[in-house]
Interface confidence: low
């Protein structure tokens, strides 16, 4: 009679993580008598996966009823596959022995490859805000994928970026891999509403890549532009001076009025108006009693934005020849937070 052969017809099996792997194995003969065992790996360090004779293997089920005497199908199913299950599986026929069974013949092995989806990319930006025209770095990380081949792209508002570096670790063989990429992005003044997107494409994603996003609103600081203008006279001895604070982001802003270098009033921007591009506008006004000044007055609008060094704009108020009354202004005295426009 021909000697028993252990046949593993599949050289390799590819399974998505979370699915069930079927490892096929048949014997060509019922003799010698003895159990089948499945191992991952070969040699002394091999790992027992299933023992027909004894043991508890909750993730493993047999394809056929091994209790049947005529059974020569020793295929198994392994459920809930993870990348850690990857490896080469051997179907081994044992000859019944005493006191122990003796290994008789092994199949050629089936390599189980696990396709594991990458984790959702996590994009993180710089710790501190930066202003337009500066270059900032964003990192993107994704883990746990297999096989190693993966494609990562960066986008800013749908436009692909080219200035980035990507590493996949580890370099050698592993059950799963991680990717780390750093992209450099040049900020522009219109970036408050912008997004940086890290897109990861992998065989497991079936053409539907994963994306991680970072809002540049968390990264950018758009400094305000100041414009100080003298409004028509409110009363015979009063002049209304406005400070228009335009196109700033984020909203955190404190404004101080100085008269000849002395602090007149400090206020915090509260009711601002949002532009289409996400920046804000705000206006403050100061009612100056001209009769209280003998000499010309230097009015300074000083703005501290988002904890940055103050910027200021000054206006020289000539007290000797101030214009006549031109109607009353609707603004309330000594308050300033008038909304400006939107974008």
């Amino acid at each position: 009679e021909e000697e028993l052969q252990v046949i593993q017809p599949d050289k390799s099996v590819l399974v998505a993580a979370g699915e069930t792997a079927t490892l096929r194995c048949t014997a060509t003969s019922l003799i010698p008598v003895g159990p089948i065992q499945w191992f991952r790996g070969a040699g002394p360090g091999r790992e027992l996966i299933y023992n027909q004779k004894e043991g508890h293997f909750p993730r493993v089920t047999t394809v056929s009823d091994l209790t049947k005497r005529n059974n020569m199908d020793f295929s198994i199913r392994i459920g809930n596959i993870t990348p850690a299950d990857a490896g080469t599986y051997y179907c081994v026929k044992f000859r019944k022995g005493s006191p122990d069974d003796v290994e008789f013949k092994s199949g050629a092995g089936t390599e189980l490859s696990v396709r594991a989806k990458p984790s959702a990319p996590v994009v993180s930006g710089p710790a501190a805000r930066a202003t337009p025209q500066h270059t900032v770095s964003f990192t993107c990380e994704s883990h746990g994928f297999s096989p190693r081949d993966i494609t990562l792209k960066w986008f800013k508002n749908g436009n692909e970026l080219s200035d980035f570096q990507t590493n996949v670790d580890p370099v050698g063989e592993s059950v799963s891999y991680s990717i780390h990429s750093t992209a450099k992005v040049v900020l522009t003044r219109e970036d408050v509403h912008s997004q940086v997107i890290c897109e990861v494409a992998h065989v497991t994603l079936q053409g539907d890549p994963l994306r991680g996003t970072a809002n540049l609103s968390e990264t950018i600081r758009v400094p305000p532009t100041l414009e100080v203008t003298q409004q028509p006279v409110r009363a015979e001895n009063q002049v209304n001076v406005t400070c228009q604070v335009r196109k700033f982001y984020p909203q955190r802003l404190q404004l101080t009025w100085l008269e000849n270098g002395n602090v007149s009033r400090t206020e915090t921007a509260s009711t601002v108006t949002e532009n289409k591009d996400g920046t804000y506008n705000w206006m403050s006004w100061l009612l100056v009693n001209v009769s209280a000044h003998r000499d010309d007055v230097k009015l300074t609008c000083q703005v501290e934005h988002d904890g940055q060094p103050a910027v200021s704009k000054s206006h020289d108020l000539k007290v000797s020849a101030h214009p006549k009354e031109q109607g009353s202004n609707t603004a309330a005295e000594n308050t300033g937070s008038n909304e400006r426009n939107i974008y």
Epitope: T188, D277, R340
Partner: antibody, heavy 119, light 105 residues
Framework: VTLDESGGGLQTPGGGLSLVCKAS????????MAWVRQGPGKGLEYVAE????????YYGSAVQGRATISRDNGQSTVRLQLNNLRAEDTGTYFC?????????????WGHGTEVIVSS | AVTQPASVSANPGETVRITCSGD????YSWHQQKSPGSAPVSVI????DRPSDIPSRFSGSASGSTATLTITGVQAEDEAVYFC???????????FGAGTTLTVL
């Protein structure tokens, strides 16, 4: 604030026109600029707008795909190119300064330039 | 779309209010045009702001999706068509009202 439009006149249907607005009296590069038109006996209609840096254009639905707005901050000019002209493009085209952006922030208007589309 | 009354009239010195209602517009401007085709003049922008060369009798307010232009102590020279401009934030669109003709009796 002065906004001076030019480039209007008699245009033929299917052709193109180029309107230019020359600005003075303010820091041009600090403001969005827009074009608004008014047909004969009609109301005002938003045409196009461009951000202060020139990087972001916005277009009204009536000209979307036919219009291109651009600006030259060095010359303090804003240009509107309108192609595939139709009779309904006839009207006075006004250049506006937008304090922030959108028609809700228009704070200054030019005198306008008249465009007549007719064969 | 935004809606404003076709016409309003008032005697000199009276207070005139013109409303402009939109679907979901958040911000408005008001523009005065004394004759068709002539250059409009912005009297109010961003709901409440008044250009420096506009008399203080012009004021603006907005509540919800409605804006109001108020002329306190209307004068004969205020006779004109007033257009409201609105930015609809939900549709990111810019629209003007059809105009309100103000007649000073």
């Amino acid at each position: 604030v002065t906004l001076d439009e030019s480039g209007g006149g008699l245009q033929t249907p299917g052709g193109g026109l180029s309107l230019v607005c020359k600005a003075s009296g303010f820091d041009f590069s600090n403001f969005n600029m827009a074009w608004v038109r008014q047909g004969p006996g009609k109301g005002l209609e938003y045409v196009a707008e461009i951000s202060d840096t020139g990087s972001t254009p916005y277009y009204g639905s009536a000209v979307q795909g036919r219009a291109t707005i651009s600006r030259d901050n060095g010359q303090s000019t804003v240009r509107l190119q309108l192609n595939n002209l139709r009779a309904e493009d006839t009207g006075t085209y006004f250049c506006t300064r937008n304090f922030g952006s959108s028609v809700s922030s228009i704070d200054a208007w030019g005198h306008g330039t008249e465009v007549i589309v007719s064969s | 779309a935004v809606t404003q009354p076709a016409s309003v009239s008032a005697n000199p010195g009276e207070t005139v209010r013109i409303t402009c209602s939109g679907d979901s517009s958040s911000y408005y401007s008001w523009h005065q045009q004394k004759s068709p085709g002539s250059a409009p003049v912005s009297v109010i922008y961003s709901n409440t702001d008044r250009p420096s060369d506009i008399p203080s009798r012009f004021s603006g307010s907005a509540s919800g999706s409605t804006a109001t232009l108020t002329i306190t102590g209307v004068q004969a020279e205020d006779e004109a068509v007033y257009f409201c401009g609105a930015y609809d934030s939900s549709s990111d669109s810019d629209i003007f009202g059809a105009g309100t003709t103000l007649t000073v009796l």
